[in-house]
């Protein structure tokens, strides 16, 4: 094995452990919580990411609803079981027998039941909406430079391919960003927008998850864009399901 | 040369707790993971948990979780594994190593549980 | 936890021959895999790390494949002094496991 390397660290994942004892002495990099070791030129998968925050704070979220079939990560953090690749497995279950399946996010899109309870297929979130409230400004920023900026965060922070990127829509004080990522369109080596989605809105809290890097300064024409309020929708490609006393509720 | 020597043979009654020490040298103590690993006797190996000097997070096997507390102290390079409530299937080889491949081992350590 | 079954459980080989020892896991772990020989009264010794990387020191008489769930420990010819117990150890996840071994016996 080769000496500790001077900068053994993971740029990408600050909830890792990293030493020098990967294939040839390198540089390896783990998940806390689940000791998988991850990719650190690319973003860690959200599965990995919420198995390292489990001593975080509950951050619960209710967001409104663009269209009958969105959802909305209601249920706030919980411990998820991961695939051999890190990605969410359909069907997670809590320590009390409790099970629901999730779709490629990690969102809850069934009822809850029991142990019997069969997820088929981890079913993907093909259409993401990023629903941002920006503080106050002197006036409104200029349509296509916040559009070209958003869009270089994602190209440039979060290494996501410009054609994930959909559409930046803006009425002031409203910013919505649509990701989407239809399965037969991710290549392998893409980040998907569910990752994206999850360092952006854990960097728009002030949570970054980039290792030594500065929190986000998101500045459009040099005018500081703060934002106020996130709501997030995931859209997948197969509608939830969902009892009828859920949706009246 | 890297070395991991750890702390002699101890007999415990059950019910009593038990400390191993293991002291690392030939390398910087602080940048590999050092994990705990057991054998009883006539028994295959059993990973209890690991520690990561550098900043003390370590992670158990659910198996230890409640009675197994692992520690370290830079200063003298050493790791060191509690295991308490002690009882007769205790009664193991314990071994410090080191990294992720188990690259280099301790002698062990016998605990008697009696 | 990841699973690891060693076969066989016992193996009865003569000097100088090829002896081919197993190792399956219970889900991919790419080649997260690593073997040691342990002697009666000794600790375990790392003979090959993730799969197939060799170890410095160790004899080129012993080589490890695979990846994904299916591994191989190969002595191409053996020495009386390999005669031992062989194990298997993961370390894709916490937390880590071992195969049970396999015991190399002198036929």
């Known amino acids: 094995h080769t000496a500790a390397q001077d900068n053994c660290t993971c740029p990408t994942n600050k909830m890792t452990v990293c030493s020098p004892d990967g294939p040839g002495g390198r540089c390896q990099c783990r998940a806390l919580g689940s000791g998988m070791a991850v990719d650190c030129s690319t973003l860690t998968s959200k599965c990995l990411l919420l198995k390292a925050r489990m001593s975080a704070p509950k951050n619960a979220r209710t967001l409104v609803r663009p269209s009958e079939h969105a959802l909305v990560d209601n249920d706030g953090l919980y411990d998820p079981d991961c695939d051999p690749e890190g990605r969410f497995k359909a069907r997670q279950c809590n320590q009390t027998s409790v099970c629901w399946c999730v779709n490629s996010v990690g969102v809850r899109r069934t009822d809850k039941g029991d142990l019997s309870l069969r997820c088929d297929e981890l079913v993907r979130t093909h259409h993401i909406l990023i629903d941002l409230r920006h503080r106050p400004t002197a006036g409104a920023f200029n349509h296509s430079d916040l559009d070209a900026e958003l869009r270089r965060l994602f190209r440039e922070r979060y290494r996501l391919h410009p054609k994930f990127v959909a559409a930046v829509h803006y009425e002031q004080p409203t910013i919505q960003i649509e990701l989407r990522q239809n399965t037969s369109q991710k290549a392998a080596g893409d980040v998907d927008i569910g990752d994206a989605a999850y360092y952006f809105e854990r960097d728009i809290k002030g949570e970054s998850l980039f290792q030594g890097r500065g929190g986000l300064d998101l500045r459009v024409r040099g005018e500081p864009l703060q934002v106020e309020r996130t709501l997030i929708y995931y859209l997948d490609e197969i509608p939830p399901k969902f009892s009828m006393k859920r949706l009246t509720a | 040369q890297v070395q991991l020597v750890q702390s002699g043979a101890e007999v415990k009654k059950p019910g009593a707790s038990v400390k191993v020490s293991c002291k690392a040298s030939g390398y910087t103590f602080t940048s590999y993971w050092i994990n705990w690993v057991r054998q009883a006797p006539g028994q295959g190996l059993e990973w209890m948990g690991n520690?990561?000097?550098?900043?003390?997070?370590?992670n158990y096997n659910q198996k230890f979780k409640d009675r197994v507390t692992m520690t370290r102290d830079t200063s003298t390079s050493t790791v060191y594994m509690e295991l308490s409530s002690l009882r007769s299937e205790d009664t193991a080889v314990y071994y410090c190593?080191?990294?992720?491949?188990?690259?280099?081992w301790g002698q062990g350590t016998l605990v008697t549980v009696s | 936890e990841i699973v690891l079954t060693q076969s066989p459980a016992t193996l009865s080989l003569s000097p100088g021959e090829r002896a081919t020892l197993s190792c399956r896991a219970s889900q991919t772990i790419g080649t997260s895999i690593h073997w040691y020989q342990q002697k009666p009264g000794q600790a375990p010794r790392l003979l090959i790390y993730y799969a197939s990387e060799s170890i410095s020191g160790i004899p080129a008489r012993f080589s490890g494949s695979g990846s994904g769930t299916d591994f191989t420990l190969t002595i191409s010819s053996l020495e009386p002094e390999d005669f031992a117990v062989y194990y298997c150890?993961?370390?894709?996840?916490?937390?880590?496991?071992f195969g049970q071994g396999t015991k190399l016996e002198i036929k």
């Open positions: 150890q993961q370390s894709n996840s916490w937390p880590f496991t």
């Open positions: 520690i990561y000097p550098s900043d003390s997070y370590s």
């Open positions: 190593a080191r990294g992720s491949s188990f690259d280099y």
